[in-house]
Amino acid sequence: TLNSVLNSNAIKNLPPPLGGAAGHPGSAVSAAPGILYPGGNKYQTIDNYQPYPCAEDEECGTDEYCASPTRGGDAGVQICLACRKRRKRCMRHAMCCPGNYCKNGICVSSDQNHFRGEIEETITESFGNDHSTLDGYSRRTTLSSKMYHTKGQEGSVCLRSSDCASGLCCARHFWSKICKPVLKEGQVCTKHRRKGSHGLEIFQRCYCGEGLSCRIQKDHHQASNSSRLHTCQRH
């Protein structure tokens, strides 16, 4: 259950939610390993080799979708698969990478002024002009496309990073996903371990900004592996 989240020292000692990032620019967000959040969904990164079983797209990361690994495979065995890039075949929007959508069975670019994301329902408490999703739990496989133009500002609820304005990414915070700032030089970031540990998290942090990567802080080299601090640094 999620109760362990409140018993975890890690949660009290996490850096501020806006203060961290992924160690690879290809991923929208970075997970704070070992932390559980309501919903129980897990987010995979390109550092992870272990396939993550899923029942629906929203259980996967922002750059993934949920499907059977083999064509015509057992429908009961589904895993998170890498999203499909532009001009690749698709059956639904969630299969296409952020910034694209599925049209006539092919992933095509989302013209910002024509198509933006998938929203199941217009939120009754709409956030100004942010027609944003709910709690990050919307079931993407059943969503209908809505047309809207405004990119989410900092603090807006979002589904994926393409819902957020420039300089922001879509990252989990507690029970929701909101637009948070991409990290600046010197800010704390999260470097994922390679061993496929598929950490549950309650906070996700954006990636490091352009020209920056998530690296171990020089004065922390002597520290134990578990307590090494990573920050966004110039390449």
């Epitope: 409140l6 949660i11 009290k12 329902e121 408490e125 029970w175």
Partner: antibody, heavy 117, light 107 residues
């Protein structure tokens, strides 16, 4: 529109349990997490816990040390909060609250639970 | 848990006055601060989320500012219907915690 309708007031004896319900309408129940917050008479607000109706996952405030259990019935779009081993200082109005982001956007009308011998 | 301290605990002002309530967090909470209004016998209502974003349907006379540990809630021109208790809430770290409230009365 979104509505959260809670069960009526309860009077309980110390040591007893209470189960408060919160019936949701006007939205897809499984799409939003549901929180429970209580307010003792003349006091402030205190978060008790959260449940994800889509899978029943829960997270609780440690202060309640296993005395509280949150559940949902998806078929009736109803969330429940059970508090056990009631004490006089559990006398409070108990609210369910639905989130859209990390904030509580919609609230039930509240249920007064009085614990008295 | 993060402690939230509101001040003043009560205040009296006249219609048309500018009213300011402050909220201090025991540690840095970035922008993860919400403000709620509660009228007697009613459930709280969300006014402001993420420090300064106005919830839908909330009049523009309400505003929020600050960052880190010190935050301010302002009513630019007090109206009779604004009589209520106002609470700040941090959602930076679990469990979410609230300030003790500020009771606003009309002079």
């Amino acid at each position: 529109q979104v509505q959260l309708v809670q069960s009526g007031a309860e009077v309980k004896k110390p040591g007893a349990s209470v189960k408060v319900s919160c019936k949701a309408s006007g939205y897809t129940f499984t799409e939003y997490t549901m929180h429970w917050v209580r307010q003792a008479p003349g006091q402030g607000l205190e978060w008790m816990g959260v449940i994800d109706p889509s899978n029943g996952d829960t997270s609780y405030n440690q202060k309640f040390k296993g005395r509280v259990t949150l559940t949902v019935d998806k078929s009736t779009s109803t969330a429940y909060m059970e508090l056990r081993s009631l004490r006089s200082d559990d006398t409070a109005v108990y609210y369910c609250a639905r989130t859209t982001g990390p904030w509580f956007a919609s609230w039930g009308q509240g249920t007064l639970v009085t614990v008295s011998s | 848990d993060i402690q939230m301290t509101q001040s003043p605990s009560s205040l009296s002002a006249s219609v048309g006055d500018r009213v300011t309530i402050t909220c201090r967090a025991s540690q840095d909470i970035s922008n993860y601060l919400n403000w709620y209004q509660q009228k007697p016998g009613k459930a709280p209502k969300l006014l402001i989320y993420y420090k300064s974003r106005l919830h839908s349907g909330v009049p523009s006379r309400f505003s929020g500012s600050g960052s880190g540990t010190d935050f301010t809630f302002t009513i630019s021109s007090l109206q009779p219907e604004d009589i209520a208790t106002y609470y700040c809430q941090q959602v930076h770290t679990l469990p979410p915690t609230f300030g003790q409230g500020t009771k606003l009365e009309i002079k």
